[in-house]
């Protein structure tokens, strides 16, 4: 947010940049929260655009019984590991195929015990205000599905008739991490000392961090013909004077006709 200055007054302007604004030789370069020739005005909306997607990561352990552990499986670049990874990934893609939020699996470690597979199940959803609920539900379905498959796909007579077989008791969910996104908190932080007056409103499921000086929202302050200006004590209406009227009042809704005042008469609209 910059305002260019030309002429003799510029040097004076330079020393008068307010609110942390810096002079670049032509204009005041204003910090995010401010605008105007001297950075004297507080913006009425702050971009807190959410990420397009929110991710979750589930740390799981399953025990694969249809493969015997060999030392080569510790080496992630070995043919053995690569083949195991391919089969395991294909198997998990089948297991979680009904979950729209499912992205894939990432094997972190293979260890002895048949083959104990430490891995992450990766989930992702489009950002909406309900993303936490969506991902919570998805993690529950993941738990259900992996429990079901590790109970059903088991070795019979030392042979697996499925793509992979599992130890029913070897399935554990270690940890669930969801990317945190709190628009209200972000809005408060970015509004700094004006945080008490900025709020989050949603439009088309997208959050907007706005002060009452931003028009078009439910919290918007109607200053009528005046101008809404933010101060440390909150939003205020700066009322205007026209050729014919003075405006006053909390929302500049009281107009006084000048001619009537000069004629010692007051008239309110």
């Amino acid at each position: 947010r910059t305002t260019t200055c030309f002429g003799d007054g510029c040097q004076n302007t330079a020393s008068r940049c307010k609110n942390g604004g810096t002079w670049d030789g032509l204009k005041c370069q204003c910090p995010n929260l401010y605008y105007g020739e001297l950075c004297e005005e507080v913006v009425s909306s702050i971009d807190i655009g959410p990420p397009e997607t929110i991710s979750a990561q589930m740390e799981l352990t399953v025990t694969v019984t249809s493969v015997k552990f060999t030392e080569e499986l510790k080496n992630h670049s070995s043919q053995e590991f690569q083949e195991f990874k391919q089969t395991f990934t294909e198997q998990m893609n089948i297991v979680y195929s009904g979950i729209p939020e499912y992205v894939g699996v990432n094997i972190t470690k293979l260890r002895l015990g048949s083959v104990v597979v430490e891995h992450d199940v990766l989930l992702r959803t489009k950002y909406t205000p309900e993303y936490k609920t969506v991902l919570d539900n998805a993690t529950e379905v993941v738990k259900e599905k992996i429990t079901k498959v590790t109970t059903q796909q088991i070795m019979i007579n030392d042979i697996c008739s499925d793509m992979m077989c599992f130890n029913t008791t070897g399935t554990q969910v270690q940890n669930i991490t969801v990317t945190q996104y709190d628009p209200e908190e972000d809005c408060r932080k970015m509004a700094k000392e004006y945080g008490d007056y900025f709020v989050v409103e949603y439009r088309d499921q997208k959050p907007y961090c706005i002060s009452p000086c931003e028009p078009g929202f439910s919290v918007s302050k109607n200053c009528n013909l005046g101008k809404c200006q933010m101060s440390l004590s909150g939003p205020q209406c700066l009322c205007v004077t026209t050729e014919t009227h003075w405006y006053s009042g909390e929302t500049c809704n009281q107009g006084t006709q000048k001619s009537l005042v000069y004629g010692h008469h007051h008239h309110h609209h």
Partner: nanobody, 123 residues
């Protein structure tokens, strides 16, 4: 590159015998697992027998006691001795390989395949 070439298929009478061979190249044959699968016309591919590098062998119930799987690591070869053949054994027989020590007779668990050899059991 892994290459598997089957041979030994043919026409045999019910009750007869046949020995299938699979010549392997492009990998360390002595490691991992080898197996035989078969696919009858109009049916899904099914596991027949498996042998691992540790010597473990496993068989489908339908061939137990009649078929024997073996390997010769020096010759990079896999074999399937088929005795007491029945009409229902008629199928294309495939050799499959894995770098893993597998205990699975599901085709989805196997990554490397030969082209197959036809076995017809008929009088």
């Amino acid at each position: 590159e892994v290459q598997l070439v089957e041979s030994g298929g043919g026409l045999v009478q019910p009750g007869g015998s046949l020995r299938l061979s699979c010549a392997a190249s492009g990998f360390t044959f002595s490691r991992g697992s080898m197996s035989w699968f078969r696919q009858a016309p109009g049916k899904e591919r099914e596991g027949v027998a498996i042998i691992s590098s540790d010597g473990w062998t496993g068989y489908a119930d339908s061939v137990k006691g009649r078929f024997t799987i073996s390997r010769d690591n020096a010759k990079n070869s896999l074999y399937l001795q088929m005795n007491s053949l029945r009409a229902e054994d008629t199928a294309v027989y495939y050799c499959a390989a894995s770098f893993l020590v597998l205990r699975a007779l599901n085709p989805k668990a196997w990554h490397y395949w030969g082209q197959g050899t036809m076995v017809t059991v008929s009088s």
